[in-house]
């Protein structure tokens, strides 16, 4: 019969054949053969593989670092890798959870529209049409833009939500 | 390495006043918003004011509005508190911290004890 070249779901192709993957929680010990199945074997006590796989070694169990302010949420298994969250009062930096902040703040374009509490983050609020922010900042509200007027000014250059306008001189009309 | 170092604390009389210091290195301190924040024995951590990088922009807690004036030192990485007309509600660890608030960027924190 001709190779294959292509395999069923939870099979790969090596060496023109057709193999197993191993399951979630074991690794690739050895590929099958015309005369036996794929080996694997489970993943060690901190180690994890979350999905049908051929790797030949397991991942390692997130560590949630206590001087970070991290703390494990959820224990890892041999098919899961750890969760981790921050202590009480504190807040994750990204969806991954790598390190903690006391609360947020709020980026260039942003204000503060809420000062942080005990027990709710900084609320951002984006800075409308004739405000700016040009910094991060966890209590600076966004600022009007400059009034070139009321300077006997004209405006320049136009403000955007993270830029005050530029005002400079009227053009004198030469007689 | 971010450092913050708080000193200043002790304690004082109910109505006196003391100087809270905190001595930055390890980042470009005029670059960062700064702020002090306490906690209270047995309470969360609470938000006491804030300045902005130039100082020209501050932040008061209700509770310390009028009583407390913070100001920093851009030529000596340097960020104060001064609290004036103290209570025993204001006995707590006070903690300088930087803008974005890392956990591993805090200090020890100093004590401030208001007692008769």
């Known amino acids: 019969p001709e190779p294959p070249t292509a395999c069923r779901e939870k099979q790969y192709l090596i060496n023109s054949q057709c193999c197993s993957l191993c399951q979630p929680g074991q690794k690739l010990v050895s590929d099958c053969t015309e005369f036996t199945e794929t080996e694997c074997l489970p993943c060690g006590e901190s180690e994890f593989l979350d999905t049908w796989n051929r790797e030949t070694h397991c991942h390692q169990h997130k560590y949630c670092d206590p001087n970070l302010g991290l703390r494990v949420q959820q224990k890892g298994t041999s098919e899961t890798d750890t969760i981790c969250t921050c202590e009480e009062g504190w807040h994750c930096t990204s969806e991954a959870c790598e390190s903690c902040v006391l609360h947020r703040s709020c980026s260039p374009g942003f204000g503060v529209k809420q000062i942080a509490t005990g027990v709710s983050d900084t609320i951002c609020e984006p800075c409308p049409v004739g405000f700016f922010s040009n910094v991060s900042s966890a209590f600076e509200k966004c600022h009007p833009w400059t009034s070139c007027e009321t300077k006997d000014l004209v405006v320049q250059q136009a403000g955007t939500n993270k830029t005050d306008v530029v005002c400079g001189p009227q053009d004198r009309l030469r007689a | 390495e971010v450092q913050l170092l708080e000193s200043g604390g002790g304690l004082v009389q109910p109505g006196g006043s003391l100087r809270l210091s905190c001595a930055a290195s390890g980042f470009t301190f005029r670059d960062y918003e700064m702020w002090w924040v306490r906690q209270a024995p047995g309470k969360g951590l609470e938000r006491v004011s804030?300045?902005?990088?130039?100082?020209?922009?501050?932040y008061y807690a209700d509770s310390v509005k009028g009583r407390f004036t913070i100001s920093r030192d851009n030529s000596k990485n340097t960020l104060y508190l001064q609290m004036n007309s103290l209570r025993a509600e204001d006995t707590a660890v006070y903690y300088c911290?930087?803008?974005?608030?890392?956990?591993?960027?805090w200090g020890q924190g100093t004590l401030v004890t208001v007692s008769s």
């Open positions: 804030a300045i902005n990088p130039w100082g020209g922009l501050t």
């Open positions: 911290a930087k803008l974005p608030f890392y956990f591993h960027e």
